[in-house]
Each structure stands twice: as C-alpha cells, then as structure tokens.
C-alpha cells in the first residue's frame, strides 16, 4: 500500500489542506491497515486540537502523534505533550499557542508504536483551520424611527474576520441572513415596530488572513421589539 495525495502547485482554494502519505510495506500485515485521518482546528489562535477516530482501530491502540513545521526554523520533530483521550485511548493532541505557527506548513504524523512502519503523515495549512470564538456583547441602537443598528465584538483581530448576521421576527418561519465584512456592524433599515425581532451573529477567519471554511458558534441571540423595554428605546441589549 502506498497512498499519496499530493497537493499540486498553485492556489490553496483549488487544493486540499493536507496530503496524506502512508509508509509502503512489503507484505500484507497489520501495517497495511490505514491509520485514521487527523483533523486539526485552531481555536481562536489560543490552542489547537488535532483529533482522530480512535474507534476505527481494529483493537484499542494508543496511537502517538509527532509534528513539525516544514521548511522553517521550527522543523524539529516534536512529540505531543498533551494527549486527548477517548475511553482511555489516545484520540487527539492539544497544542498551545506558543506551538502554533499559522503561516508555516504544519506536518503531523500519526504512528502505531507497536508497528512503527505503520504511520501516516499529513500536511496542513493552519490558516485555513482557524475557528474564532462566537461574537459577544451584541447591542442594538435605534438610529431612527425605523432603522436599527446591530453591533458586536470579537475576541480577535477584526480585520481577519467576516461575519454572518441572521435575523427574524416572531412571525417568520426562517432566518434572513446578511454577510458583513470586518466592520462588525449591521443596519436594518426598515423595522416594523409591531414585531419582535431576534438577531444572532457568527464569524469566520476569512479572507484576508486565511481561507477557513468553518464558522464560529452562533452568538447568544439578542431581541428587539414590541415587548422590549420602554424606558430607553435608543439603546437596548437583551440576552435570550
């Protein structure tokens, strides 16, 4: 068995974020069994979890993980120092902020310590695997009789993010959504004062600093409308 998915030269968006190589073997044995794929996500560039499906192994196996950065000053092979476990079997590795280099090619190697020839290596572009924390501190301002402005904060460099706002009224069956750039504000020009509105936001590390496909979790919703506070109609922020 010799599986190689090579990344062609060119654009990130036309290639996989990894390629996988499996050590060739001379005879069919346990070492021909493919190792599970490693999936890594960088959470708000605070830590990274690289995980694999430990239950895909034919028998419980404490697979080991090594990593390094290709063609860089950080190309020394590192052992995982903080394993994640599933039912007492290794199922992942957590790397801390100081070990994360977003703009260098991350190489991760999974190995069966009982069968050292059984190993798989993947290359990952970490800037495409960043997931920010959900937006926080949603606030609504009434700009005029019929116009609302929604603002929020991110625990992140704003220029690196894009956002998706969803809103609906109690009369709606589905959400209306609007893409928003790094400026983290959204205006709704026409608000019906007889309806109650719900807004929520999520964010993504895209496009200036990376090409992440995964969105953050949704923010806590915020509400505005017929049964909200009468005391200060010009500034209102209410958690669900």
């Amino acid at each position: 068995l010799n599986t190689t998915i090579l990344t062609p030269n060119g654009n990130e968006d036309t290639t996989a974020d990894f390629f996988l190589t499996t050590m060739p073997t001379d005879s069919l044995s346990v070492s021909t069994l493919p190792l599970p794929e490693v999936q890594c996500f960088v959470f708000n560039v605070e830590y990274m979890n690289c995980t694999w499906n430990s239950s895909s192994e034919p028998q419980p196996t404490n697979l080991t993980l090594h990593y390094w950065y290709k063609n860089s000053d950080n190309d020394k092979v590192q052992k995982c120092s903080h394993y994640l476990f599933s039912e007492e079997i290794t199922s992942g590795c957590q790397l801390q902020k100081k070990e994360i280099h977003l703009y260098q090619t991350f190489v991760v190697q999974l190995q069966d310590p009982r069968e050292p020839r059984r190993q798989a290596t993947q290359m990952l572009k970490l800037q495409n695997l960043v997931i920010p924390w959900a937006p926080e501190n949603l606030t609504l301002h009434k700009l005029s009789e019929s116009q609302l402005e929604l603002n929020w904060n991110n625990r992140f460099l704003n220029h690196c993010l894009e956002h998706l706002v969803q809103y609906r009224t109690d009369w709606d069956h589905s959400w209306t959504e609007q893409s928003v750039d790094y400026r983290h504000k959204f205006s709704l020009p026409s608000v019906d004062g007889q309806k109650r509105y719900t807004f929520r936001v999520r964010s993504r590390f895209n496009p200036l600093c990376g090409s992440a496909q995964h969105w953050s979790e949704w923010s806590h919703p915020i509400h505005w409308g017929s049964n909200t506070s009468k005391e200060n109609p010009f500034l209102f922020a209410l958690e669900a």
């Epitope: 560039v45 860089s72 280099h101 703009y103 260098q104 090619t105 690196c160 200036l208």
Partner: nanobody, 117 residues
Framework: QVQLQESGGGLVQAGGSLRLSCAAS????????MGWYRQAPGRQRELVAR???????YYSTSVKGRFTISRDNAKNTLYLQMNSLKPEDTAVYYC???????????WGQGTLVTVSS
C-alpha cells in the same frame, strides 16, 4: 509602528499591465503574511492576493491567472504584477501585513488603479 507605502498605480488601458510595490519600514521577514486588497467606490473591500513568508500564495478567483504576488524580503518590498487588466479591476489597492501573533493588522494609504475601456 509599521509603515507600508504603496506605489505603481495609475491609468492604464484594458488589457494592459501594471506593477504595484509596497515598501515596508521594517524587515518584512517579521511579517508572516502580506497581501493586497482593493476597494472600489461604494463597494466592500475585496481580497486580491496574499503570500506567506514561506512563499505560499493565494489569489481571489477574480484575478487568478492574471495577477502575481511576490515578496522580496531583502528589499522589504511586496509586489503585485497585474496583467490583462479589466475595467472591473479599477479600485484603490492597499497592501497589508499581519504578524503570526495576529496582534496587529498593518495597511498602507493605497494606490489608485484606473483601467479604461
């Protein structure tokens, strides 16, 4: 504070070429990601291209195959070679830089590119 200064913009006919430069006030080897974005009047900003310190580049679909981004760490300069220009490429082009820590986002004053038909 990092200063980035763009140059090379101007008026060009459709099908023509321009080369934009972005000079940095510090060693760009310390800037892990550099790129170009553009903004046309009344439009949201749009990523054009970006390149890591290791030379790994990315292009938006609208410019892929026509534009080439490169960086010269010895000259502390980022470049954008623009070929086969189209009227819809008309915009102010900004260069930007981001350290790996994401502690800051640096960008320049911009240079205007006008493509006439």
């Amino acid at each position: 504070q990092v200063q980035l200064q763009e140059s090379g913009g101007g008026l060009v006919q459709a099908g023509g070429s321009l080369r934009l430069s972005c000079a940095a006030s510090i060693s760009i080897s310390k800037i892990d990601l550099m790129g170009w974005y553009r903004q046309a009047p009344g439009r949201q900003r749009e990523l054009v291209a970006r390149v890591t310190n290791g030379g790994d580049s990315y292009y938006s679909t609208s410019v892929k195959g026509r534009f080439t981004i490169s960086r010269d760490n010895a000259k502390n300069t980022l470049y954008l070679q623009m070929n086969s220009l189209k009227p819809e490429d008309t915009a102010v082009y900004y260069c930007y830089g981001v350290p790996e820590s994401l502690a800051a986002f640096h960008w320049g004053q911009g240079t205007l590119v006008t493509v006439s038909s």
